[in-house]
Interface confidence: medium
């Protein structure tokens, strides 16, 4: 599936790239999937298409939805989908999980934190950087091009880092912020806030009624076998064992697997004989350890027997 999740905050700029790539000479048409309505290309519109890019200048919560892009060439058409979610600005400092970009790790030798998605924007230096909502100050922090360099990295440098920059479009300025977690690698082994590798946040899993379905919750917790780490599934906020549906079971035996030296755990949710009512449930993949809990939500949707995607 050529589908990509994108997210942003209301009143900030958001630029989304079509998940289907093509030559610059190919035309790209954008549509709002729910209505099949074409997205205009005129820059006077708040939301407009510009080749492979879809621009929200600025974004509004109501812009949330699935957008279709069709890359057209003389010989073929390629279709992609951009799942866009615009969130209200948080009043407090806490950046919710669903606004976080991928976690990056650093060590004494390498401590670059790249500002996520910045390459899509027309921005000028300098970038502003914040850690846990506090502006970074001191000679250890150096904003360099599109990344932050931290000198003499310590374990205390782990946290959530936000980059803030200005996107310029035809003389108008729009603010953009992006946040990602930074963890500090210790060659001795370390423990970190859980990072869920699968499923993606708010993933839609297509299933066939009457067939069996499997959902895998996979998360990493640090380096070395981790004590007090677990992954599990919940249905509508209830433990699987307490939910009382024998068709839906967790597969026990969370053996620790090591990917890139990281300690990771898997938990498979098996749904036998998928029923209509299963589509109404909220499936939460939970990963927890001493540092805290991370949750990714999955919903099921009915798979059409014949899919006409080009």
């Amino acid at each position: 599936k050529f589908s990509k999740q994108s997210w942003g905050l209301e009143n900030e700029a958001l630029i989304v790239r079509c998940p289907r790539q093509g030559k610059p000479s190919y035309t790209v048409d954008w549509y709002y999937s729910q209505t099949n309505k074409s997205i205009p290309t005129q820059e006077r519109n708040r939301v407009f298409a510009s080749g492979q890019l879809l621009k929200f200048l600025p974004a509004a919560v109501a812009d949330s939805g699935i957008y279709t892009c069709i890359v057209r060439s003389p010989t073929f058409n390629r279709t992609g989908y951009a799942n866009v979610t615009i969130y209200k600005k948080q009043s407090d400092c806490n950046v919710p999980d669903y606004l976080m970009y991928s976690t990056v790790s650093g060590s004494e030798k390498n401590s670059k934190i790249y500002c996520p998605t910045i390459d899509l924007y027309n921005w000028t230096a300098p970038l502003e950087w914040f850690k846990n909502c506090q502006a970074l100050q001191g000679s250890r922090y150096r904003a360099h091009k599109s990344f932050l360099v931290i000198d003499n990295v310590m374990t205390e440098d782990a946290g959530d880092y936000t980059c803030k920059f200005i996107h310029n479009e035809n003389g108008a300025n729009y603010s953009v912020t992006a946040t990602r977690s930074f963890t500090v690698k210790d060659e001795q082994g370390f423990s970190l806030f859980p990072v869920i590798g699968a499923p993606a946040q708010n993933e839609i899993k297509e299933v066939e009624i009457g067939k069996n379905a499997n959902l895998t919750c996979s998360a990493c917790f640090g380096k070395g076998t981790q004590f007090l780490a677990a992954v599990l599934w919940q249905l509508n906020g209830t433990k699987i064992t307490d939910f009382g549906e024998p068709r839906i079971q967790q597969e026990e035996g969370q053996n620790q697997s090591f990917s890139n030296g990281l300690a990771c755990l898997d938990m498979v949710l098996r749904i036998a004989d998928v029923k209509e009512e299963d589509l109404l449930l909220q499936y939460d993949c939970l990963a927890l350890n001493l540092h805290g809990l991370r949750r990714h939500t999955v919903r099921l949707s009915r798979k059409n027997p014949i899919d006409h995607h080009s």
């Epitope: 374990t155 782990a158 210790d186 001795q188 082994g189 370390f190 423990s191 970190l192 640090g222 380096k223 070395g224 076998t225 981790q226 004590f227 007090l228 677990a230 599990l232 919940q234 433990k239 939970l286 927890l288 001493l290 540092h291 809990l293």
Partner: antibody, heavy 121, light 106 residues
Framework: EVQLLESGGGLVQPGGSLRLSCAAS????????MSWVRQAPGKGLEWVSA????????YYADSVKGRFTISRDNSKNTLYLQMNSLRAEDTAVYYC??????????????WGQGTLVTVSS | DIQMTQSPSSLSASVGDRVTITCKAS??????LTWYQQKPGKAPKLLIY???KRPSGVPSRFSGSGSGTDFTLTISSLQPEDFATYYC????????FGQGTKVEIK
């Protein structure tokens, strides 16, 4: 001041059951993993079980798996250990311990005074 | 499970002495090592965590070092209140404790 107060220990016959409680005060109970550690008379320390903040995940030593159940009631700031099918080798002082948060693994930073469980016929 | 072996199992020392207790893990445990002090009839007390970190309230004469499989607890100048049993514990995997080292008055 952090305080942990265990209760529920006593003499029980092999095969019997006992429920230990640990009343916590002086800290935000729901923010911490909690654990039980035991110490047989004149012996060293043995980790028994642990539970996550909201009780979603539980962990057990192989020696007690299937016989002991750890649980918690955050509204009452209380940790429990339900012990079934008790054996003579379960005789020990049982300590309730708080697990500190941090990237350096699970250290038990505060301990209760312990409650003695004696399994004997 | 990872086995933790302490040495010596007991030692006699005088006030003011420098005391060293070692703890060896059967497998690599990184820095996930903790030391506790226990006095007779009392609960254990956290002394050192994360191999070398001291909680507030623990005197600076207590220090920890080592990494991987070999660790050391050092008391730079033994005080009367330090006569007790000391345990190491790993939490790299399911927690296990050393058998203890009893520090007695010479």
């Amino acid at each position: 001041e952090v305080q942990l107060l265990e209760s529920g220990g006593g003499l029980v016959q092999p095969g019997g059951s006992l429920r230990l409680s640990c009343a916590a005060s002086g800290f935000t109970f729901s923010s911490y993993f909690m654990s039980w550690v035991r110490q047989a008379p004149g012996k060293g320390l043995e980790w028994v079980s642990a539970i996550s903040r909201e009780g979603r995940a539980t962990y057990y030593a192989d020696s007690v798996k299937g016989r002991f159940t750890i649980s918690r009631d955050n509204s009452k700031n209380t940790l429990y250990l339900q012990m079934n099918s008790l054996r003579a080798e379960d005789t020990a002082v049982y300590y309730c311990a708080r697990i500190r948060v941090g990237p350096s693994g699970g250290a038990f930073d505060y301990w209760g005074q312990g409650t003695l469980v004696t399994v004997s016929s | 499970d990872i086995q933790m072996t302490q040495s010596p199992s007991s030692l006699s020392a005088s006030v003011g002495d420098r005391v060293t207790i070692t703890c060896k893990a059967s497998d690599h445990i990184g820095k996930f090592l903790t030391w506790y002090q226990q006095k007779p009839g009392k609960a254990p007390k956290l002394l050192i965590y994360g191999r070398n970190k001291r909680p507030s309230g623990v005197p600076s004469r207590f220090s920890g070092s080592g990494s991987g499989t070999d660790f050391t607890l050092t008391i730079s100048s033994l005080q009367p209140e330090d006569f007790a049993t000391y345990y190491c514990q790993q939490s790299y995997s399911t927690p296990t404790f050393g058998q203890g080292t009893k520090v007695e008055i010479k």
